[in-house]
């Protein structure tokens, strides 16, 4: 199942960065009735998920970059 | 040793509130959940809501969302639960429990709520 | 929300019997599902999470099974200390919660 049908919060603990060229996607899930913070979660090239720390400038940047390039949702 | 320690009983009067601490020791705070549970005399277990040790970042049941505020402490590993606007019906034992270990990587296994205080009695009397 | 329903509601058994405790979703969980044991004036105590996956420091005669909607917790041969109150639990998602308990007392 997508990570958006989810019903609870999927991210303790956060990376304050991670490598651009590692990663083939990232998604940001607003705050909602199931998760009270904003998550962003990144798909990496070798298939594994990782959280990202959205208050992270890095992280920040990396959303940006992202979303230029169609992989941001 | 690894524990969550809960502050004392404390006897209140309709409309006043209350602040819980459940103090972790032993363990690494930040990847566990901070669950609050409480259990009214002779009842079932009622999940309050919880807190996340980074972010700070509190989950509420509806039931109590106008009510309960959960917040933390990092310098001390402490988290606290304030209810609010008490009845006589908020009389129970408030459990504080933790749930992971979990790092960095988002998953859908969930682990159970392995380590609980020893709860603390909250009356509420006129 | 989620309903757990736990049934029976009290088991009455002597000790060295088997026990068998269900717990039924009212939509599916997954297998995150936990088991927990309570004594009176005690906090609960984390018996099996995940469905199955045992907890260190628990005895082996507890286990558990099921996924979806429907879960069991069995007691292989039940020890004086083992009469108590169980509680499922899901944590699938929140709000989370418990099934209304199974008392186990002794025959």
């Known amino acids: 199942a997508p990570l958006a049908t989810e019903l609870r919060c999927q991210c303790l603990q956060t990376l304050q960065g991670i490598h651009l060229k590692n990663i083939q996607s990232v998604k940001v899930k607003s705050p909602g009735p199931h998760c009270a913070q904003t998550e962003v979660i990144a798909t990496l090239k070798n298939g594994q998920k990782a959280c990202l720390n959205p208050a992270s400038p890095m992280v920040k940047k990396i959303i940006e970059k992202m979303l230029k390039n169609g992989k941001s949702n | 040793q690894v524990q969550l320690v809960q502050s004392g009983a404390e006897v209140k009067k309709p409309g006043a509130s209350v602040k819980v601490s459940c103090k972790a020791s032993?363990?690494?705070?930040?990847?566990?959940?901070i669950h609050w549970v409480r259990q009214a005399p002779g009842q079932g277990l009622e999940w309050m809501g919880n807190?996340?040790?980074?972010?700070?970042?509190?989950n509420y049941n509806e039931k109590f969302k106008s009510r309960v505020t959960m917040t933390r402490d990092t310098s001390t590993s402490t988290v606290y639960m304030e209810l609010s606007s008490l009845r006589s019906e908020d009389t129970a034992v408030y459990y504080c429990?933790?749930?992971?270990?979990?790092?960095?990587?988002?998953?859908?296994?969930?682990?159970?709520?392995?380590?609980w205080g020893q709860g603390t009695l909250v009356t509420v009397s006129s | 929300e989620i309903v757990l329903t736990q049934s029976p509601a009290t088991l009455s058994l002597s000790p060295g019997e088997r026990a068998t405790l269900s717990c039924r979703a009212s939509?599916?969980?997954?297998?995150?599902l936990h088991w927990y044991q309570q004594k009176p004036g005690q906090a609960p105590r984390l018996l099996i999470y995940?469905?199955?996956r045992s907890v260190s420091g628990i005895p082996a005669r507890f286990s558990g099974s099921g996924s979806g909607t429907d879960f069991t917790l069995t007691i292989s041969s039940l020890e004086p200390e083992d009469f108590a109150v169980y509680y499922c639990?899901?944590?699938?998602?929140?709000?989370?919660?418990f099934g209304g308990g199974t008392k186990v007392e002794i025959k």
């Open positions: 429990a933790r749930e992971g270990p979990y790092s960095y990587y988002p998953s859908r296994q969930y682990y159970g709520s392995d380590l």
């Open positions: 032993g363990y690494e705070f930040t990847s566990y959940w």
């Open positions: 807190i996340s040790p980074n972010s700070g970042s509190a």
């Open positions: 939509q599916s969980i997954s297998n995150n």
């Open positions: 995940y469905t199955s």
């Open positions: 639990g899901q944590n699938n998602e929140w709000p989370e919660v």
